[in-house]
């Protein structure tokens, strides 16, 4: 998490014009995880590497966007590039490239995440939702999701909307939300941890 957009950008920018064209065509037919839509063909084919990077991140978020990019690169026979991309973005899949901060480990952890355990209390008691959104924006929340949460009229409905996106999150994404909660309402987290 955190640098997937950078890793995707480097991978796509290091494709030749012909390879980028091939990448886009493969992206139109690559199998997608359930619940994810496809980038419209018309928009996709006209994009440069930078636009495509941002579109991948906004459509699929950073973690899945990087995984999908690596899958397509592998399918194109670019195993080394796919491997480098995954090394830079996937938790526990080897060291990050020299000089790059390795992402936090996200091995399977026993039981429910704090965020899921205390869902009802967080919906009822979080007041600083805007702060959370800013902390999560571009990392685990797409622009659309960010706007959708902000559009809700009350804090509980904002939190309810935010929780509607968490089923697609991995443990690391939930850790980011927990970290943001610790920074904005530490007393609430401490209270819930004691309960």
């Amino acid at each position: 998490m955190g640098r997937a957009r950078d890793a995707i950008l480097d991978a796509l920018e290091n494709l030749t014009a012909e390879e980028l064209k091939k990448f886009k065509l493969k992206l139109l037919s690559v199998p997608l995880r359930e619940g994810y839509g496809r980038i419209p063909r018309g928009a996709l084919l006209s994009m440069d590497a930078l636009d495509l990077t941002d579109k991948l991140v906004s459509f699929y978020l950073e973690t899945y966007g990087a995984e999908l990019t690596a899958n397509v690169l592998r399918d194109m026979g670019l195993q080394e590039m796919a491997g480098q991309l995954q090394a830079a973005t996937h938790q526990g899949s080897g060291a990050a490239p020299a000089g790059i901060q390795a992402p936090p480990q996200s091995a399977a952890k026993p039981g429910l995440h704090f965020i899921d355990q205390h869902r009802a209390a967080l919906i009822a008691r979080v007041t600083n939702v805007e702060w959370l959104l800013d902390a999560l924006y571009g990392k685990v929340l797409t622009d659309e999701q960010y706007q959708a949460v902000r559009a809700e009229p009350t804090n509980p409905s904002k939190m309810r909307k935010l929780f509607s996106f968490t089923p697609a999150w991995n443990w690391t994404c939930k850790d980011l939300l927990l970290q943001a909660l610790r920074e904005s309402q530490s007393y609430l987290v401490e209270d819930l941890e004691r309960s």
Epitope: G2, R3, R5, D6, A7, I8, L9, D10, E13, N14, L15, T16, A17, E19, A49, L50, D54, M81, Q84, P97, A98, G99, I100, A135, Y137, G138, K139, D143
Partner: antibody, heavy 117, light 107 residues
């Protein structure tokens, strides 16, 4: 460890051209972009352009489009920047920097260019 | 091109203080903003990437926040080694562009 070794200081005449080099080591050369950044004495940082090493894709700041040309030699893991039609305005320190996506994590030591008649 | 406006251009503070430097982008850059520190006579060094992520090895006294068009670098418990010029840089669109810099001095 990651290193970007830049060529030594240059003294050039107005109207001439110079070619600065930046040799990379300690990382997979073709996985990144290398940028060049200009800094005049006592001034801020100005991004000149960037070259992606595997594809040779280049991007330039419009201001430097007619001034600078970026090239890469994969066999020697070296990036070059040629500056042409030199004037006193081109006297500056030029840095090469490895970009990981949209931010740079390693910089060369800088090359001082002095343009003087 | 995206313009990056940094303020203040210079700043004088006492050891132990907390200071903030602001950076405003001329258009939405999401969270694609980095902060650099350049000490006198030295090369620039990245402190923060993606608006709020601390680069490996950078002290936790440094923190970044913001998204969209407004960003802030905060340095808490100011130390003598923090004397430097600080630059923001956007990474949303080519050409990458830097702010004009903020020169930090100790009172």
């Amino acid at each position: 460890q990651v290193q970007l070794q830049q060529s030594g200081a240059e003294l050039a005449r107005p109207g001439a051209s110079v070619k600065l080099s930046c040799k990379a080591s300690g990382f997979s050369f073709t996985s990144y972009g290398i940028s060049w950044v200009k800094q005049r004495t006592g001034q801020g940082l100005e991004w000149i352009g960037q070259i992606y090493l595997r594809s040779s894709n280049t991007y330039y700041n419009e201001k430097f489009k007619d001034k600078a040309t970026l090239t890469a030699d994969k066999s020697s893991s070296t990036v070059y920047m040629e500056l042409r039609s030199l004037t006193s305005e081109d006297s500056a320190v030029y840095f090469c920097a490895r970009y990981y996506g949209s931010s740079s994590d390693y910089w060369g030591q800088g090359t001082t260019l002095t343009v003087s008649s | 091109d995206i313009q990056m406006n940094q303020s203040p251009s210079s700043l004088s503070a006492s050891l132990g203080d907390t200071i903030t430097i602001n950076c405003h982008a001329s258009q939405n850059i999401n969270v694609w903003l980095s902060w650099y520190q350049q000490k006198p006579g030295n090369i620039p060094k990245v402190l923060i990437y993606q608006a709020s992520n601390l680069q490996t090895g950078v002290p936790t006294r440094f923190s970044g926040s913001g998204s969209g068009t407004g960003f802030t670098l905060t340095i808490s418990r100011l130390q003598p080694e923090d004397i430097a010029t600080y630059y923001c840089q956007q990474g949303q669109r080519y050409p990458w562009t830097f702010g004009g810099g903020t020169k930090l001095e100790i009172k």
